[in-house]
């Protein structure tokens, strides 16, 4: 099943997020992703946990998953590089870099997103955009078109409360509020964008969605700048 959902959001403006990628397994949407360089997509390591025998591809330039669009193109994956410290049973280091079989053809609907290199927390309350093709309600309806939602960043102390994530949120993670509007599992690997810059990647750990006491968890890309640079080099 696809990992992820946008709850309480709305349909995104078509092709207004040209960095948005759909990581696909055997032709079906699995996870979100974000184009960070001409030939590289950043996603979540857990997305490929169950993909050992399947064909992994990356869809760029899409708004609708099913309808033909001039900008849409499906790329094979030359190399998948999960973060070396990612593990199945933790949310830590949940990053994955996918090298496309060739450089993406760039244009208005396909463009890499600048990512944050300065290792400093986003101020609590900052509104950030998260997008994805995950299910849109608790009944499990899957959208065909890209959805998005604006979420306020939550301070780490609140996110670390026992009734929230009880100390699991390290300095390399950040949280966003989850009161009915939320990202969740299948949006895993998708981008959290603050002020036009990639700040976080949706983690793919299992959690309740849309419950304000269980905020969304995002991997802070700035904390992994050295690793990203070393893989892209």
């Amino acid at each position: 099943p696809p990992r992820g959902r946008i709850l309480g959001g709305r349909e995104a403006e078509a092709h207004a997020r040209p960095y948005m990628a759909s990581v696909q397994l055997n032709g079906a949407h699995l996870c979100g992703g974000v184009l960070v360089a001409e030939q590289w997509v950043l996603s979540a390591a857990h997305c490929l946990e169950d993909a050992a025998d399947g064909k992994v591809q990356v869809l760029l330039g899409a708004h609708s998953l099913s309808q033909p669009e001039p900008s849409k193109r499906l790329y094979d994956v030359l190399r998948a590089v999960p973060h070396p410290d990612s593990q199945p049973d933790t949310i830590d280091h949940d990053l994955l870099l996918l090298q496309l079989s060739e450089k993406a053809t760039l244009g208005p609907a396909v463009r890499p997103l600048p990512w944050q290199r300065v290792d400093r927390d986003v101020a609590p309350g900052t509104l950030c955009d998260v997008a994805g093709w995950g299910i849109v309600n608790h009944a499990g309806r899957r959208p065909d078109s890209l959805q998005h939602v604006l979420l306020p960043v939550l301070d780490r102390a609140t996110c670390n409360r026992r009734t929230h994530h009880d100390g699991a949120i390290t300095e390399r993670l950040m949280c966003a509020e989850s009161n009915r509007r939320d990202s969740c599992k299948g949006d895993s690997g998708g981008p959290l964008v603050c002020g036009g810059v990639l700040e976080g990647v949706v983690t793919s750990g299992s959690r309740v969605c849309g419950n304000r006491k269980k905020p969304g968890i995002y991997t802070r890309v700035a904390s992994y700048a050295a690793w990203i640079d070393s893989v892209l080099a």
């Epitope: 609590p124 301070d155 780490r156 102390a157 609140t158 670390n160 409360r161 026992r162 009734t163 009880d166 100390g167 949120i169 300095e171 309740v208 419950n211 006491k213 269980k214």
Partner: antibody, heavy 116, light 112 residues
Amino acid sequence: EVQLQQSGPELVKPGASVKISCKASGYTFTDHYMNWVKQSHGKSLEWIGDINPNNGGTSCNQKFKGKATLTVDKSSSTAYMELRSLTSGDSAVYYCTREGASFAFWGQGTLVTVSA
Amino acid sequence: DVLMTQTPLSLPVSLGDQASISCRSSQSIVHSNGDTYLEWYLQKPGQSPKLLIYKVSNRFSGVPDRFSGSGSGTDFTLKISRVEAEDLGVYYCFQGSHVPVTFGAGTKLELK
């Protein structure tokens, strides 16, 4: 290694105030709420309140409203609790404890004795 | 406030015995997020309390597997399969689901 170092014992007169401190080290101070707990001699534990070091926001047990004031100094990674209008009933050991991984980390306690 | 009632208040044991401590809350401590924030702490004389069990049955890191927690709703139990000398002290149950968070009165585990 997470450590919470509390200030030393206090002997204070009835009606006076006292301010005790809890200096945090081994983690980022603003990443966790700090809680305060009272333990009267030979008795159980009572939660006083908590504070978010990011913004100074506090939540207090109704029983300690007007008695305890919680503050933080982010620059020194220190939490403070001021107790005012002290009576013999305030004589106790006071603990700070970090929230996040439940209350896994506690200070060593500060003994406050109220006596004329 | 949620009242946490522990029984017994004193539990004399011999080393190697199994020990069982009960904790009952005055109302359900299932949080609105679905989790139950029932914890157990051990306090030895002159020391700060130490976390043993969180969310009813999860052992905190470094806690020996002779400690186990169980229960649901309002009734909870801490079991020590074979008591060792280092286990002696006062055990407190705690609920973190409702504000104000509250502790039980404590159970003193002591040698017979």
